[in-house]
């Protein structure tokens, strides 16, 4: 991974584009920290394992987060 100690936040760009929950392998929500003062959302896609930084402020992404948490709560007993 092209990381150096000076890189503070993971996302160079963020995407507003809606993501189909079915095409998601994983969704990571990285809370703000001393290294990066903003929340970062990283989606790992099933196709080729592509990772995409998502815009936490986007309506489409907020809807995605709701859909994913709904799906998780369905699965958990």
């Amino acid at each position: 991974v092209p990381l150096s100690r000076t890189v503070r936040c993971t996302c160079i760009s963020i995407s507003n584009q809606p993501v189909n929950p079915r095409s998601l392998e994983k969704l990571e929500i990285i809370p703000a920290s001393q290294f990066c003062p903003r929340v970062e959302i990283i989606a790992t896609m099933k196709k080729k394992g592509e990772k995409r930084c998502l815009n936490p402020e986007s309506k489409a992404i907020k809807n995605l987060l709701k859909a994913v948490s709904k799906e998780r709560s369905k699965r958990s007993p």
């Epitope: 990381l3 000076t6 760009s13 963020i14 507003n16 080729k48 990772k51 995409r52 930084c53």
Partner: antibody, heavy 124, light 109 residues
Framework: QMQLVESGGGVVQPGRSLRLSCTAS????????MHWVRQAPGKGLEWVAV????????FYVDSVKGRFTISRDNSKNTLYLEMNSLRAEDTAIYYC?????????????????WGQGTTVTVGS | EIVLTQSPGTLSLSPGERATLSCRAS???????LAWYQQKPGQAPRLLIY???SRATGIPDRFSGSGSGTDFTLTISRLEPEDFAVYYC??????????FGPGTKVDIK
């Protein structure tokens, strides 16, 4: 459509300064990292600098560190390159380029939108 | 620092022929970080391939990318007249920096 327009190039004497601008339209500028890439006459492409979408990180090629500063004003949809202590070897076409949607340190989507470039000539 | 080498320097082919362009890295590069660009005289570069093998938006399917580790390839299955240009590979590396190869010129035989 997505567009980037560079300005501010010109002829300048060695040791002097110049500020390049790049104005974006057709996309949400504040969502994308931005780059400056240059091309000396008859030569290949050389990456110069990058700035994260929110300005959180900035990085430079070694040859311009301490002389050039990349910055952005998201309220004006504009990217800048402040060039100080210019040298003859800085003579080039300077392009601004958009970092692809969703790029991060774990996956790189390439520079997907480019301006037409502005020419900087350093010489006496 | 990773150095990219492209070969051949110039490729002379006829329209309709297959073009195979090579990009070699001095150290292993994750395929997630490799891109290819096309540049025609007097024009800005254009992104063709990212992630070593994914075509950028609007790029015809005659362009394909492959490879991993230190060896990457851009293939143009059947050259069209508009494909004669210079092609650059590029990698995103640590620090982070974004390095371009020296380019391969594809010209008409």
């Amino acid at each position: 459509q997505m567009q980037l327009v560079e300005s501010g190039g010109g002829v300048v004497q060695p040791g002097r300064s110049l500020r390049l601008s790049c104005t974006a339209s057709g996309f949400t500028f504040s969502n994308n990292g931005m780059h400056w890439v240059r091309q000396a006459p008859g030569k290949g492409l050389e990456w110069v600098a990058v700035i994260w979408f929110d300005g959180m990180n900035k990085f430079y090629v070694d040859s311009v560190k301490g002389r050039f500063t990349i910055s952005r004003d998201n309220s004006k949809n504009t990217l800048y390159l402040e060039m100080n202590s210019l040298r003859a070897e800085d003579t080039a076409i300077y392009y601004c380029a958009r970092e692809g949607d969703g790029s991060g340190i774990y996956y790189y989507y390439g520079m997907d939108v480019w301006g037409q470039g502005t020419t900087v000539t350093v010489g006496s | 620092e990773i150095v990219l080498t492209q070969s051949p320097g110039t490729l002379s082919l006829s329209p309709g022929e297959r073009a195979t362009l090579s990009c070699r890295a001095s150290q292993s590069v994750s395929s997630s970080y490799l891109a290819w660009y096309q540049q025609k005289p007097g024009q800005a570069p254009r992104l063709l391939i990212y992630g070593a093998s994914s075509r950028a938006t609007g790029i015809p399917d005659r362009f394909s990318g492959s490879g991993s580790g230190t060896d990457f390839t851009l293939t143009i299955s059947r050259l069209e007249p508009e494909d004669f240009a210079v092609y650059y590979c590029q990698q995103y590396g640590s620090s982070p920096i974004f390095t371009f190869g020296p380019g391969t010129k594809v010209d008409i035989k």
